[in-house]
Interface confidence: low
């Protein structure tokens, strides 16, 4: 079977499985709610609104071929750092081996020269990245682990030739604000690649990322906040210089709100993020003073 054909087949199988898995999860959640006869929990957050267009001086991030519409993100997991997510395994584990194999097939073929020469390559790479990020939240830990390794391999192999596309796909996952594991997988990788964004793209990325980071800061999961706090210094070191005073204040306010959290982890990560936002702004001293005044105001 030709490389491209193998790739498409793996794409289709994996995509349909992941959609089916998400539907099953939603059904199971609904059944559990009905069985418990309790008032239903708040619905999952709606897909994030379309980001505002960058201001005139900023360019769009990249021309985007239309990927298939992503399935709706599952609701965020519990606000617990340690407890793993429990999901019923019936019917899903039957194809665990297939999912691992599909990930490996995609991983192997997306870096193959024959696929890289294809006029469809940018689109295929986008789908591959989306699927690996989806699989980062698979119910089976070994599928998650393989997906994680695949993301690392693909990024390493294609960094020289396709860095802007890789950055864009990771950004799109952050923007999606979906499952905690997928979000974390995208966040830390985007942060690692942020310093490689071309200077003319830094302002557009900053403008588009600000609402995402603000939204992520509102997530209840401690694990997400940990990853966000590790990512913010790297993202701000790359883009902080391109932010105006108002944008810095909006971001700071989001983290200041977390200082009132009942979770010590969320309070600590918020404090670290706020400090690094000031540190990497254009007016470091001004924002340190501004932050200090706001904090003193909270104490009064």
């Amino acid at each position: 079977m030709a490389t491209l054909e193998k790739l498409m087949k793996a794409f289709e199988s994996l995509k349909s499985f992941q959609q089916q898995q998400q539907q099953q999860q939603q059904q199971q959640q609904q059944q559990q709610q009905q069985q418990q006869q309790q008032p239903p929990p708040p619905p999952p957050p709606p897909p994030p609104p379309q980001l505002p267009q960058p201001p005139p001086q900023a360019q769009p991030l990249l021309p985007q071929p239309q990927p298939p519409p992503p399935p709706p993100p599952p609701p965020p997991g519990p606000a617990v750092a340690e407890e793993p997510l429990h999901r019923p395994k019936k019917e899903l584990s039957a194809t665990k081996k297939d999912r691992v194999n599909h990930c490996l097939t995609i991983c192997e073929n997306i870096v193959a020269q024959s696929v890289r020469n294809s006029p469809e390559f940018q689109k295929l790479l986008g789908i591959a990245m989306e699927l690996f990020l989806l699989c980062s939240d698979d119910a089976e830990s070994d599928v998650r682990m393989v997906a994680d390794e695949c993301l690392n391999k693909v990024i390493k192999a294609l960094m020289d030739s396709n860095l802007p596309r890789l950055q864009l796909e990771l950004y799109k996952e952050i923007k999606k604000n979906g499952a905690p594991r997928s979000l974390r997988a995208a966040l830390w990788r985007f942060a690692e690649l942020a310093h490689l964004v071309r200077p003319q793209k830094c302002r557009p990325y900053l403008v588009n990322l600000l609402p995402c980071l603000t939204r992520t800061s509102k997530r209840p999961e401690e694990s997400v906040q940990e990853t966000l706090a590790a990512a913010v210094p790297k993202i701000m070191a790359s883009f902080g210089n391109f932010a105006n005073d108002n944008e810095i204040k909006v971001l700071l306010k989001a983290f200041i709100a977390n200082l009132k959290s009942s979770s010590p982890t969320i309070r600590r990560t918020a404090a670290g993020s706020a400090v690094s936002i000031c540190q990497h702004s254009r007016r470091t001293q001004y924002f340190y003073s501004w932050l200090l005044n706001v904090l003193l105001g909270l104490l009064v």
Partner: antibody
């Protein structure tokens, strides 16, 4: 290839403080992907988890050692370290540094280990 | 803390034998159970993670099963390099805890 290497004194006096460093190659200790851990093993006994650190300086310690332990990161040298205070003979063990594997931070195995360093507490 | 108990504590077997080691957790840990092999003077090496997933480069004669409180590690046909001490470890929560070990010796 990820490699971890422990370094520090082989002999420490009782009541003193043990300082060990783990130097990492092939991975970045500042990456939001991993937890960096310390484990020890007294001769002929089971492995004992000491604690772990995350790049945001978040730490988890074994409650049995918490009052005496500090684990920290040195991102500029790509290292992480262990400090254990008020040593007694019971702290004599082989000390290992390790990395929790990526993919599922909430329940990850220790996929990479250093070769271990023997620490003897004796006057 | 979650207590991990392995049985047997030691086991004598011959090359080619099939052996099974059991690990029991003091509370529910789902499938967050890892197995390590340790040879004298060496660091532990991951063999099985998440109860049943084989770590890359570990031979397929190793397999793991179980969920909840009870887990097993099986070696289908012992090879000379398999004689070592095996530890189970829960990664369900912190503090991470290990079993006391099962020493596998040549009969």
């Amino acid at each position: 290839q990820v490699q971890l290497q422990e370094s520090g004194p082989g002999l420490v006096k009782p009541s003193q403080t043990l300082s060990l460093t783990c130097t990492v190659s092939g991975a970045s200790v500042s990456s939001g992907a991993y937890y960096w851990s310390w484990i020890r093993q007294p001769a002929g006994k089971r492995l004992e988890w000491i604690g772990r650190v995350y790049p945001t300086w978040s730490t988890n310690y074994n409650p049995s050692l918490e009052s005496r332990v500090t684990i920290s990161l040195d991102t500029s040298n790509n290292q992480f370290s262990l400090k254990l205070t008020s040593l007694t003979a019971a702290d004599t063990a082989v000390y290992y540094c390790a990395r929790e594997a990526p993919g599922d931070y909430d329940a990850a195995p220790l996929a990479y280990w250093g070769q271990g360093t023997l620490v003897t507490v004796s006057s | 803390d979650i207590q991990m108990t392995q049985s047997p504590s030691s086991l004598s077997a011959s090359v080619g034998d099939r052996v099974t080691i059991t690990c029991r957790a003091s509370q529910y840990i789902s499938h967050y159970l890892n197995w390590y092999r340790q040879k004298p003077g060496k660091a532990p090496q991951l063999v099985i993670y998440a109860a049943s997933s084989l770590q890359s480069e570990v031979p397929s004669r190793f397999s793991g099963s179980g969920s909840g409180p009870e887990f097993t590690l099986t070696i289908s046909s012992l090879q000379p390099e398999d004689f070592a001490t095996y530890y189970c470890q829960q990664s369900y929560t912190t503090p991470r805890t290990f079993g006391q070990g099962t020493k596998l010796e040549i009969k």
